[in-house]
């Protein structure tokens, strides 16, 4: 007889989750010499240990300690790139500008990017049918706790000038309820972070407005300034040209504004 299984509102664990995590780990350690010492089987065991056999609405930061330990990796000052609602462009940027890093360019973020996972209380099975939804079921689910944990740590260890890429096409360019707005902003350390520089990415080709004057950007500036961190903002009117100029900064067309 099939065992009764809790039905959650969210989609289930990503298919081939164990194989995906293991393969990503191997690929990452091959490409990043400073992480070659990492034992990917141990990484998978630690990842699995964070949620297997546990009630998926009762996951804590503590559950991820073994994984966080194995994924320890530092980012040089001035090289942190945060993003909100514009992940693809942020990742395209760091693929070109190899000395800057989003969370997903670090081992921990790379392993989990775009994946869903959860287990069930008292069984060693992974739940591929459904996982808790943050809004409809519970916030202390394996995926949400993971991202909240690593996002907070990523922000609190950033130093120098920190950059953030924001989506200028959205009604709330800065959204207080996003991971950036609710977690990362509040964990930047004034003793270490001299400034936050926001890059507002324009969507429309003919959009010449100064989105740095948007009320939500002013709200971000206020939050940051109150934390004794300087704030700067730049409009990126042509994201395609912006990326092209990162690739080829000597191009004559890159000497004018982007």
């Amino acid at each position: 007889l099939p065992r009764w299984r809790q039905q959650w509102s969210g989609s289930g664990t990503t298919s081939r989750f164990p194989e995906t995590v293991l393969a990503r780990c191997v690929k990452y350690t091959e490409v990043h010499p400073e992480m070659r010492h990492v034992d990917c089987q141990s990484v998978w065991d630690a990842f699995k240990g964070a949620f297997i056999s546990k009630y998926p609405c009762n996951i804590t930061e503590e559950d991820y300690q073994p994984l966080v330990k194995l994924g320890t990796q530092t980012v040089p000052c001035n090289k942190t790139l945060l993003w909100s609602r514009i992940k693809d462009l942020a990742h395209q940027f760091t693929q070109v500008q190899r000395d800057m890093f989003t969370l997903e360019d670090m081992l921990l973020g790379y392993l989990a990017d775009d994946l869903t996972w959860c287990g069930e209380f008292n069984t060693f099975e992974i739940n591929y049918q459904s996982c808790p939804d943050w809004r409809k079921d519970c916030s202390n689910n394996p995926v949400s706790v993971f991202w909240k944990t690593v996002s907070r740590r990523f922000a609190e260890t950033a130093c120098g000038v920190v950059h953030v890429m924001l989506n200028g096409s959205r009604s709330k360019i800065f959204d207080k309820n996003s991971t950036f707005g609710s977690v990362e902003v509040h964990n930047l350390q004034p003793e270490k972070v001299q400034a936050l520089e926001a890059w507002v990415i324009h969507g429309g080709r003919e959009d010449s407005r100064d989105l740095c004057q948007d009320p939500t950007i002013k709200e971000l500036e206020s939050i940051i300034s109150k934390r004794n961190i300087r704030f700067f903002c730049k409009n990126i009117y042509r994201p395609d040209k912006f990326l092209q100029c990162v690739k080829n900064p000597e191009d004559s067309s890159c000497l004018s504004g982007i």
């Epitope: 503590e62 300690q65 966080v68 330990k69 320890t72 740590r153 609190e156 350390q189």
Partner: antibody, heavy 122, light 112 residues
Framework: EVQLLESGGGLVQPGGSLRLSCAAS????????MTWVRQAPGKGLEWVAV????????DYADSVKGRFTISRDNSKNTLYLQMNSLRAEDTAVYYC???????????????WGQGTLVTVSS | QSVLTQPPSASGTPGQRVTISCSGS????????VNWYQQLPGTAPKLLIY???NRPSGVPDRFSGSKSGTSASLAISGLRSEDEADYYC????????????FGGGTKLTVLG
């Protein structure tokens, strides 16, 4: 409440042995690396040994290597330090501490026990 | 002889700002983060600052940490009598086996 409670200290003769215990409560013990740190009377802190969350990795200060053994029993939420061939210079208060990892920076010792005094003297 | 060097003592009067330094090398502070611990008389050490400058919850913002190159420092502003304690810096040394290293400690005296 997160707590660490050391026991097993006492007076021992040079060349003797002693086993210290550290009972953990208020947190999921098997998720954390654990460490021992000692402090000789009137002196500073000296790191002694560390053990990984699952007991598979151990590391020791040169001053105790080959004489001290760190171990843990996750089913009992207890950390141990077996001390053999004790010397007068091992006289100290021994603290156990929890090791906390942050992911993007080095770890810290975020929770400490109250310590247990080991006196090595004839 | 400690791997990390701290002044043995420091002092200040209530309300003053006091700084305690911790000097190391490229193999420890230069390439690893620094933690600071406070040890009140007759008690166990307590984590005061982690990852160079971060305060655990419950630690007053009068305490701040910073790092530059191979040196770190702990600043205490608005000094209070209850801050009288020993302060230790701690880091990791990639050139040593058993890489965890402490400074020798600084005894802070609050005068008056």
């Amino acid at each position: 409440e997160v707590q660490l409670l050391e026991s097993g200290g006492g007076l021992v003769q040079p060349g003797g042995s002693l086993r210290l215990s550290c009972a953990a409560s208020g947190f999921t013990f098997n998720n954390y690396d654990m460490t021992w740190v000692r402090q000789a009377p009137g002196k500073g802190l000296e790191w002694v040994a560390v053990i990984s969350y699952d007991g598979s990795d151990k590391d020791y200060a040169d001053s105790v290597k080959g004489r001290f053994t760190i171990s843990r029993d996750n089913s009992k939420n207890t950390l141990y330090l077996q001390m053999n061939s004790l010397r007068a210079e091992d006289t100290a208060v021994y603290y156990c501490a929890r090791v906390y990892y942050y992911g993007f920076s080095g770890p810290s010792m975020d929770v400490w026990g109250q310590g247990t005094l080991v006196t090595v003297s004839s | 002889q400690s791997v990390l060097t701290q002044p043995p003592s420091a002092s200040g009067t209530p309300g003053q700002r006091v700084t305690i330094s911790c000097s190391g090398s490229n193999s420890n502070i230069g390439s690893n983060t620094v933690n600071w611990y406070q040890q009140l008389p007759g008690t166990a050490p307590k984590l005061l600052i982690y990852s160079d400058s971060n305060r655990p919850s419950g630690v007053p913002d009068r305490f701040s940490g910073s790092k530059s190159g191979t040196s770190a420092s702990l600043a205490i502003s608005g000094l209070r009598s209850e801050d009288e304690a020993d302060y230790y810096c701690q880091s990791y040394d990639s050139s040593l086996s058993g890489s965890r290293v402490f400074g020798g400690g600084t005894k802070l005296t609050v005068l008056g």
